[in-house]
Every structure is written in C-alpha cells, then in structure tokens.
C-alpha cells in the first residue's frame, strides 16, 4: 500500500531506536570515512524530520522518497570533495542514478585502521555514562568498515554488545567476563559480513534470479515439509528483503524482514515444527535465530527424485512448459532431501540437470539422453565430498594455525602475484574452517565447509577486482559463484611467475615482535612463510617446515633473552642465511 | 501456456496418403525434439516416430519405417507426419508430444483407414 510519506510510515513502523540505527549504518556504509560525530548529527537531523512527517505528512518534503531524502543530506557534507574524491560527483546526478553511485563506491577494503578494543574499565566507564552513544559508536565502526553488513542482523549484534556489557560491566572482573564473550560475538558478526557480502555479490553479479535459486534451496534443505509454493513465496520476500539491504534501502529492508519473521511465526504449521522457540523471543532475536534454526525432521515417505525428473515422460514437456518453475521444482525436491549438501554443490546440481535438458530435449529420444542424468551427478558429489574429508583430516593433524600455514602455502603457490596482506587474511579466514566445521556431525560438515569457503573466496575476489594481479585469480573470479570454489581448488602452481627476489629485510625481525598479541605474532610470521613461498614457489612442504620451526625457535628462544635487541641484531642475519641454504 | 495443435486427419483408403500438421506455441519450439504418438481405439498409446530440434535426427517404430516421414519447419514452429501406404492397423488418434516420449497432451486428429 503506498504512504503519503514514506519516512513517516518506517518510522512508525520500526520506532524511533531501529529507526535512528539503521540510518546511521547507512550513512557509515556510504560515506565510509566521516567520524562518528559528523554522522550522529545527520542522524538526528533526519529524525527531527521524520517526527515532523509524523505529525503531519503533507509537510513539505515529507514526500520525498528515501533515496532523495538521505542523498541530499550526504550531498551537504561541506568538504565532500576533499574527503572522498570523485564520488562527489553522483551528488551531480538524479535519483536513481545517485544512490546507484554511491553504491559503487562503497569500498570493500577501506584504509581504515582495526578496530580496537577499548580495556574493560574504561569501555563500562563509556558504557555507564552513555549507552546510547556508545551503541553508535559501535555500529558506525562496524558499518564503516563493513558498508554490505546486513542492517537488521547489525542491530542484532548490538544489541547482544549491549548485554554483554551491561552484565560484565556489573562484575569484579570486568575482563575475563567481557573478552570471551566479546570475541564470541565478533567472530560471529565477520562470519555474517562475509556471508552477506556473498549475498550482494550474487544480487549484483547474477541478479535476483540467482540469489532466489540460493534461497529455494537453502530454505528447502532447512524446511523440508513446506510446500513448493510455501518455499517460494519465502523465497520471494528474502530475495526482495537482501534485495533492499544490498541496495542501501536499509529501513524498507529492515521493515520487510520484520513482516517476513512475523509471516513465518503466523504459518508454523505450513513451514516447519522447528520455529516456536524463535518465536517466542523479540523482533532482532527472532528474525535472527529463525535465520539459523535448525533443519526440521526430513517427511519419511519422500519417493525417488528420478520418479518426476527422469522416468516421468513428460520431462520435456514440462520442461517446455515453464523452465523456471520445472527447474524450481527440481531444485526444491532435491535440496529437501540432502540437507548433508551445501547450497553451492546443489546449485551446481541444478545447473548440470538444467544443461542436460537443454541438451537431451533438443534430441529425437531425450529420455535415452538425460537417462543417466542423476548418475553423472556423482563426480560433482564426491568432489566437496573429498575436499571436506582431505582438510578435516589435514586440520586435526596441524590444529588451526598449522592448517592456516599449509593452506597459507597452496594459496600462494597458485596466485603468488596476489599482495602478501590479501593471501595472509584469506589464508587465516580460509583455516578458520577448521575450528568452525570439523567438529561437527559428519552430515553438517560439507555444507558448512563450502559454504563458508565460498563467503570467504568471494571476499579474495572483491579484493582482487580492485587491482587485478593474477590471471589465475581472474579466471575463477569471472565465473559462477557456485564455480568458484571447485575452481580454486583445482588451481595449481602458477607455472608463469618469476620468483621473487630474496630480500633480507623482508625477514629481518626486531625485539618489538615479543609484546605483540599472539594473533599479530602469528600474522608476523605468516607473513614470512608468504614471502619464502614467493621467493621458492616450488619449495617442499618439509623444506618450508624446516625454516619456519627454525624461525619459531629464533622468536623463541631472543624473546627470552635478556638483552632482546643484541639478539634479534646478532642472531637475525644468521636466520637469514639459514633460511637462504635450507631453500637452496 | 504450451499449445500443441494437430490437425491433416480424416477418411482415407488402405494405400492412400495424409499429411498430418501439429501447430506448437508457448516455448522455443527448435530447443526441443518432438514425437507423434497414437492411441487405437481400445488400445494404449503407442510411439510413431520422433525428430530432433534441429531437425537432423529421426526415429521410427518398426511397424511404420519406411512409409512414414516426420519432418518440422522451425520458422512455423510446426511438426509434420507424411503418411503413404496406409493400412487398416494404422486407424488410430494421432497426436504430437515434446520431447521423445509418449505423453498424451493434446486432443489429437483422428486418422481412419477403411475401404
């Protein structure tokens, strides 16, 4: 239904807290550089005039859309030019080409520094004096490094921040009961980064057709007793609620994914057995533990899927009929019987079965063609199959770090013109995997495995868009998401690179390395291993083990040494030749 | 919506000749490989003869080689069925079908070969 005003009518409907919230994320998301303050005081300038568009919406401008609201206001920032270069120039432009500007110079690597952690007594001081603008603070820092993170779920994990505090904030030791919980919710809040990245990239690369086709058969695996029409219709107000939050329309987004969680809690009986506890909770709680419930229990009497996709004879007809809705079709049966499958090995399934039938129905006998259909699926199975039992095996051996390093290895050994940065946090995001997926029960592990792999390699192909280095890289980026993954693995040693140049002072270390964290310890000496595979491409796996226990026990043992400095000065360039001889 | 349309039936002697026409809409007729079943009354649908998209393939039952020829015009998205030397046993309702395989989808045309 349409509203004399629209920033009346999401103002209404998300109050004034989400309100405020989600423009202050999309503000940080688009203008990724602006402090905190500057942003708050567009925040509460936009606020004031929703008020007044409450109260009366045929106050002037109050029926302006969203986009020509929030873009005149990021258009006045005095000094635009200044601070962000040419993207003042879509403030030249008409709506809807300036929001579609802005967006395409939302940075996905922004040269901001990490966001660090404030020490406990001093984060409850803040905390204690302002909740309110310390919540801001917090959702501008993640929103401006993060500009595709999905709004609602952002609000979510404030809102877990704000809990968090203001129950460790109450205890003697603020600090052992911030940090785990703390790490917790940010090691989740990347994992949904990445993953709604993912999601962005398959609405912007491949349209809203391939982001449906991910929904149908994620939500098929996760409701196996809802209907074919159920599943759509879910599917259709998903791909329109990611729709909005990957274009900026972040209020509409966070509005319809509301309704969308107050649908699902309406319709349990025709969706799933499994929703009630979510249910029960409150609206940023609810829409997010639905978005993660449990698969519910599979029907016991499903018939074989070759009965309607191969053996029955009207295959083509209605195939012919309606591509799309037969493809649907497929894509649903299939998906609700194989929760143990990721959704990229499914859509990959789908396209095999499709390219079949494009094939095979353009023949005299189609059904001796695509007869064999769901038997050639079978390389396509076992290989995610092979990988998921070859890395779990690989990481209960080395552990995360060790799992990191080998993986840290292969990546560079395939695109070793790929900055040393980028290959060291892809390599760690990559091992990750470990932790997160090879303890679970075995018919959980596959899905999790590539899935996360996918999220994590579509980030390594964003980086790489912006300064293209590697024609390895390239090629696996250009195609299909669901390809990406199967293509990366498949990469090899990249046979045309001319190793680097060994350069000393790229492995020279200083005493400063000892008080490091040791995650930036870690990362110091990943950074080394990188190095040493783009120097010898083709070094062994234990020549590379050699020099690196051999620099291990060198941080070890000048970390302990009384006079550090004298240590690293003296036993650095020894290291150095070490190295240089084991990789000879 | 799918359409198939056949048409060309009617009375014929043993030995004569029809030509049978099936008129398709609704989806990219040269993607896809077409048949012509038949249904005797009292009988089962029985398979004629299928032809490929592009028109290059043809299959035939044994009971019709050699006096039936299927051939399309993919610019009029229409099938055709030239049939000669009919006979009594080939009295039947003709019908086209997507894709090889023996589905009953349409109406048909009624083909009766009597003296």
């Known amino acids: 239904e349409a509203h004399k005003s629209e920033i009346a009518h999401r103002y209404n409907d998300l109050g004034e807290q989400h309100f405020k919230g989600l423009v202050l994320i999309a503000f940080s998301q688009y203008l990724q550089k602006c402090s905190y303050d500057e942003h708050a005081k567009l925040v509460q300038e936009v606020t004031d005039f929703a008020k007044t568009c409450v109260a009366d919406e045929s106050a002037a401008n109050c029926d302006k859309s969203l986009h020509t609201l929030f873009g005149d206001k990021l258009c006045a920032i005095p000094n635009l030019r200044e601070n962000y270069g040419e993207l003042a120039d879509c403030c030249t432009k008409q709506e809807p080409e300036r929001n579609e500007c802005f967006l395409q110079h939302k940075d996905d690597n922004p040269s901001l520094p990490p966001f660090e952690r404030p020490e406990a007594e001093a984060m409850c001081t803040s905390f204690k004096e302002n909740p309110t603008t310390f919540m801001g603070h917090y959702l501008h820092e993640v929103a401006r490094r993060h500009p595709y993170f999905y709004a609602p779920e952002l609000l979510y994990y404030a809102e877990q921040y704000n809990e968090i505090l203001t129950q460790c904030c109450a205890e003697a030791d603020k600090e052992s009961c911030l940090t785990p919980k703390l790490d917790g919710v940010k090691e989740k809040a990347l994992v949904s980064s990445v993953r709604q990245r993912m999601k962005c990239s398959s609405m912007q690369k491949f349209g809203e057709r391939a982001f449906k086709a991910w929904a149908v058969a994620r939500l098929s695996q996760t409701f196996p007793n809802a209907d074919f029409a159920e599943i759509t219709k879910l599917a259709t107000d998903l791909t329109k609620v990611n729709k909005e939050c990957c274009h900026g329309d972040l209020l509409e987004c966070a509005d319809d994914r509301a309704e969308l969680a107050k649908y699902m809690c309406e319709n349990q009986a025709t969706i799933s057995s499994k929703l009630q506890t979510c249910c029960d909770k409150p609206l940023l709680k609810k829409a997010h533990c639905l978005s993660e419930v449990e698969h519910d229990t599979m029907p016991a009497d499903l018939p074989a899927i070759a009965a309607d996709f191969v053996e029955d004879q009207e295959v083509c007809k209605n195939y012919a009929e309606a591509k799309d809705v037969f493809l649907g079709t497929f894509l649903y049966e299939y998906s609700r019987r194989h929760p143990d499958y990721s959704v990229s090995l499914l859509l990959r399934l789908a396209k095999k079965y499709e390219a079949t039938l494009e094939k095979c129905c353009a023949e005299a006998n189609p059904p001796a063609c695509y007869g064999t259909v769901l038997a050639e699926f079978q390389p396509l199975v076992e290989e995610p199959k092979n990988l998921v039992k070859t890395n779990c095996d690989l990481y209960e051996k080395l552990g995360e770090y060790g799992f990191q390093n080998a993986i840290l290895v292969r990546y560079t050994q395939k695109a070793p013109q790929v900055s040393t940065p980028t290959l060291v946090e892809a390599a760690r995001n990559l091992g990750r995997v470990g932790t997160k997926c090879c303890t679970l029960p075995e018919d959980q592990r596959l899905p999790c495995v590539e899935d996360y792999l996918s999220a994590i390699l579509n980030r390594v192909c964003l980086l790489h868009e912006k300064t293209p280095v590697s024609e390895h890289v390239t090629k696996c980026c250009s195609g299909s998401l669901v390809e990406r993954r199967p293509c990366f693995s498949a990469l090899t040693v990249d046979e045309t690179y001319v190793p680097k140049e060994f350069k000393a002072e790229t492995f020279t270390f200083h005493s400063d390395i000892c008080t490091l964290p040791e995650k930036e310890k870690q990362i110091k000496k990943q950074t080394a291993l990188a190095e040493l595979v783009k120097h010898k491409p083709k070094a062994t796996a234990e020549q590379l083990k050699t020099v690196m226990d051999d620099f291990a026990q060198f941080l070890d043992t000048c970390c302990k040494a009384a006079d550090k400095d004298t240590c690293f000065s003296t036993e650095g360039p020894n290291l150095v030749t070490r190295c240089k001889d084991a990789l000879a | 919506k799918v359409q198939l349309l056949e048409s060309g039936g009617g009375l014929v002697q043993p030995g004569g000749s029809l030509r049978l026409s099936c008129a398709a809409s609704g989806f990219t007729f040269p993607s896809f490989g077409m048949s012509w079943v038949r249904q005797a009354p009292g009988k089962g649908l029985e398979w004629v003869s299928s032809?490929?998209?592009?028109?290059?393939?043809?299959l035939y039952a044994d009971s019709v080689k050699g006096r039936f020829t299927i051939s399309r015009d993919n610019a009029k998205t229409t099938l055709y069925l030239q049939m000669n030397s009919l006979r009594p046993e080939d009295t039947a309702v003709y019908y086209c079908?997507?894709?090889?395989?023996?589905?009953?989808s349409s109406r048909g045309t009624l083909v009766t070969v009597s003296s």
């Open positions: 079908t997507i894709g090889g395989s023996v589905s009953k």
């Open positions: 032809i490929s998209g592009s028109g290059s393939d043809t």
